[in-house]
Interface confidence: low
Amino acid sequence: DAHKSEVAHRFKDLGEENFKALVLIAFAQYLQQCPFEDHVKLVNEVTEFAKTCVADESAENCDKSLHTLFGDKLCTVATLRETYGEMADCCAKQEPERNECFLQHKDDNPNLPRLVRPEVDVMCTAFHDNEETFLKKYLYEIARRHPYFYAPELLFFAKRYKAAFTECCQAADKAACLLPKLDELRDEGKASSAKQRLKCASLQKFGERAFKAWAVARLSQRFPKAEFAEVSKLVTDLTKVHTECCHGDLLECADDRADLAKYICENQDSISSKLKECCEKPLLEKSHCIAEVENDEMPADLPSLAADFVESKDVCKNYAEAKDVFLGMFLYEYARRHPDYSVVLLLRLAKTYETTLEKCCAAADPHECYAKVFDEFKPLVEEPQNLIKQNCELFEQLGEYKFQNALLVRYTKKVPQVSTPTLVEVSRNLGKVGSKCCKHPEAKRMPCAEDYLSVVLNQLCVLHEKTPVSDRVTKCCTESLVNRRPCFSALEVDETYVPKEFNAETFTFHADICTLSEKERQIKKQTALVELVKHKPKATKEQLKAVMDDFAAFVEKCCKADDKETCFAEEGKKLVAASQAALGL
């Protein structure tokens, strides 16, 4: 339905508070280096303009598209060329090329200082002094560091952030109340950002069809009682929502997400029996709850899949009539029967089925040709099952930190050209799959583990894309979205890699390591481990373990010493010499 003024339409639909928050998120995700005050000024100008359009939709410029209005506003930033370099060239383009240009300059790893959490009393004072500015600053800081964060979900996080401060700043022990809540929001926020980044990568790198296939599989697992046509409608609407958010159209995205939540709740009876509680919540909580809702129970009387998709003599005719709909039905029917499979596995099965039909429907005897197609699924199913079994056993044996170290060594040997910070970040996250998924029963392990690994490997892919250094990473990241994990799993030690020159500075540590948190200390040690492997890629597990044990003992000893700095200098030299000898450096 066409509106005379798009900006007035969205302002009225979303309300002033959400409108301002979403425009701030959009601007911060585009211009990630701009100071907070500059963004607030731009947002206020856009908001005042929107109000004039609400009052009179025929007023000057009110008929312009949101991209035109927002792009024009961003291009008024005086320091655009100094701060952003070639991004300023976007402003010479016309829409829609200008918006595409801004999107291409989004930086997944912006050069921004780490967010340091102030003292609780300082935060509470700031919160009480100016709640609105405090919350806006939260949106700004998250959005600029996570340029693909799902904007309507960030509003939900901000609501929880506000609730935490409202409750805890008047508690007897503010810190005990607030810090666990902030830790939880930080961890959930990072996970949410990474999940959304995969959705955007799926749409932008592999296209709408790939995203829709993912959505059919996931929604069919979640809503196995819903008809195929119902699932298809939800997939179409969900694809629109995520296409908009990934494209920077945050107002439309938030508006359409609210409409989708409304539709789902109005049609619960034909979708899922698990939605009742979600649908009683306010909008932001409702949308979040629906996105996380548990799988409904499978209908009891589902017939065998083989009848429609293998035994039927009409398979090729049905496939030819409407290929994507027929494959969509196959994926829907398979996924609703298999909540125990990962989405990526289901997509691999559907791809195998499609490839078989393409080949067999052109054969002399199609039915004879595709009769055994389900047998081809067996190895595809067993591969992730075995991998998860082995890795969960290793995790249970080692614990999270040492399991991460095993993965650090494994991945550094596979792709040693990748930067050390990226290898540490990605391997630490890969290692978290253990505590996240291995506790689950068999039936829930694979969807938990493999779909989580898809999210983490996508982080590697987007970080690597910014500065490509490894053909192997590029190959695994670009060839097939659903085969990324098997592709990385199959990589062996890179025999072409020339070991890094030894640099003593890399292994020089100072007393500041003693004041770090346990997590930061682990990262320091893991950084050293990656560097060791880059110097000596053929080092055995035993050699590396011996050096790491010595390193841990060295840090512990020097942190207990009276003159810590001297200890680090002297003992450090000994450790480096001993390590070189142990590894033959």
Partner: nanobody, 115 residues
Framework: EVQLVESGGGLVQPGGSLRLSCAAS????????MSWVRQAPGKGLEWVSA????????RYAESVKGRFTISRDNSKNTLYLQMNSLRAEDTAVYYC????????WGQGTTVTVSS
Amino acid sequence: EVQLVESGGGLVQPGGSLRLSCAASGFTFGSFGMSWVRQAPGKGLEWVSAIDSGGADTRYAESVKGRFTISRDNSKNTLYLQMNSLRAEDTAVYYCTIGRSASRWGQGTTVTVSS
């Protein structure tokens, strides 16, 4: 909620014509291929005809080729089946479906060809 409502059926003499309609709602009609299937008394479902999402590509079962024409109007979210030269063996309940699906929606519309 997804709804497909068939209409236009009735009693017609052999050689006569009917035009069936299927009004669709609750999903993005223009994004999907659609089909007509039918079920004769005491028989299983039989696929009749299919059309792609844009209306350019149409398919027919051998038994109706040259007599039936499938079409669609995406602006009205409606699927049609023009049936000419009707025969007694065309007597059935006709259903429209999304894609070519074993599931069916709506009540169907009954076509009886008899003198």
